[in-house]
């Protein structure tokens, strides 16, 4: 009976996500058979989040809207470990929008999910950000410094990275 009601709950939760994510990849969390964490297929997972690399070239605002439709946001990077995970799935000759912007052009950078911008946990390339008109952030590869952030024009189409919380069922 208990297992039946748990299964019903899981099915109803899965139905919520089915519209945007017809397939989920789930793993058992810990030793308890009842706790599963899922990411949409073919998203990748790291800690409590799921990540999707969007290879379509779009402006920053359209990229954020695209993530939003999937129940996600453009990626907010909180730690060096998180960035190190993300870059494993990126192509060196491409640039990818982050969920970081400065719409007022006053160097008040803000994350899309309202996470406070912490100057101590940023990974700007040297000399960046360097242009008040460049109000959106990308992550890209420079041979001298490897992967880091750069400010660019928001309207310039780029690839992007979406991030969402894992789905627990």
């Amino acid at each position: 009976n208990f297992m039946y009601s748990k299964t019903v709950k899981r099915l109803s939760k899965l139905r919520e996500y089915q519209q945007y994510h017809p397939s989920l990849t789930c793993v058992m969390e810990g030793k308890d058979i009842e706790d599963w964490s899922c990411c949409p297929t073919p998203w990748t997972s790291f800690q409590s989040s799921c990540y999707f690399i969007s290879t379509g070239m779009q402006s920053w605002t359209k990229s954020q809207k695209n993530c939003s439709v999937m129940g996600a946001d453009l990626v907010v990077i909180n730690t060096r470990e998180e960035q190190d995970f993300i870059i494993q799935n990126l192509k060196r000759n491409s640039s990818y929008f982050l969920g970081l912007s400065d719409p007022g052009g006053r160097r008040h950078w803000q994350w899309v999910d309202q996470t406070p911008y912490n100057e101590n946990v940023t990974f700007w390339h040297s000399g960046e950000p360097n242009n008040l008109d460049e109000r959106c952030a990308i992550i890209n590869f420079r041979s001298s410094e490897e992967w880091g952030w750069n400010d660019i024009h928001c309207h310039v189409p780029q690839k992007s990275i979406c991030k969402m919380k894992k789905i627990y069922i």
Partner: antibody, heavy 121, light 111 residues
Framework: EVQLVESGGGLVKPGGSLRLSCAAS????????MSWVRQAPGKGLEWVST????????YYPDSVKGRFTISRDNAKNSLYLQMNSLRAEDTAVYYC??????????????WGQGTTVTVSS | DIVLTQSPASLAVSPGQRATITCRAS??????????MHWYQQKPGQPPKLLIY???NLESGVPARFSGSGSGTDFTLTINPVEAEDTANYYC?????????FGGGTKVEIK
């Protein structure tokens, strides 16, 4: 006073080349993105190319990509448009315009008087 | 590319009356309360002149009889009251993504 003065237009045969110039004054040229916008006779406005303030970014519509090249010389306060392989449909008045950024986009806050390019055999 | 459709293509208005021009975008040009639609006036033989930026902000030096409104995909430029000197073509332009695109224009004539 902000001023943008275009030059270099003229009559050219199909397949020919022209180089347009835009002399800027009255503002810190190196701090602004710049664009070329054209207007065919009796028609509407068509954006032709953009260059960022730091010269790091240029962009073109498919109609001119590979044929037109935008460039700038911040030391000379000048914007250029090199036009090669010209076609009859490139006939237009070409305006130089200054971009002013606003939030996630921009608008054109100052325009030159334009220079006329005629492509005809 | 985002397509901007202006209507009407032309209109004739008596001095003192209201003129209303609409611009419809093929997709939203708004994001988090910012509307990246702009309006320009072009008189015969002259370059375009900025009137309104970001849907509703009046450019410095532009008479207060010009106003703009709208969000998402639908935007309006209003001239009220129209004066004889307002005879011109009016264009909308979006800048939320490249390439920047212009509407086809609306010709306003004063009766």
């Amino acid at each position: 006073e902000v001023q943008l003065v275009e030059s270099g237009g003229g009559l050219v045969k199909p397949g020919g080349s022209l180089r347009l110039s835009c002399a800027a004054s009255g503002f810190t040229f190196s701090s602004y993105g710049m664009s070329w916008v054209r207007q065919a006779p009796g028609k509407g406005l068509e954006w032709v190319s953009t260059i960022s303030s730091g010269d790091s970014y240029t962009y073109y519509p498919d109609s001119v990509k590979g044929r037109f090249t935008i460039s700038r010389d911040n030391a000379k306060n000048s914007l250029y448009l090199q036009m090669n392989s010209l076609r009859a449909e490139d006939t237009a008045v070409y305006y130089c315009a200054r971009q002013l950024y606003y939030s996630y986009g921009y608008y054109f806050d100052y325009w030159g008087q334009g220079t006329t390019v005629t492509v005809s055999s | 590319d985002i397509v901007l459709t202006q209507s009407p293509a032309s209109l004739a208005v008596s001095p003192g009356q209201r003129a209303t021009i609409t611009c419809r975008a093929s997709e939203s040009v708004s994001f988090h309360g910012t509307h990246l639609m702009h309006w320009y006036q072009q008189k015969p033989g002259q370059p375009p002149k900025l009137l309104i930026y970001a849907a509703s902000n009046l450019e410095s030096g532009v008479p207060a009889r010009f106003s703009g409104s709208g969000s998402g995909t639908d935007f309006t430029l209003t001239i009220n009251p129209v004066e004889a000197e307002d005879t011109a073509n009016y264009y909308c332009q979006q800048s939320i993504e490249d390439p920047p695109t212009f509407g086809g224009g609306t010709k306003v004539e004063i009766k």
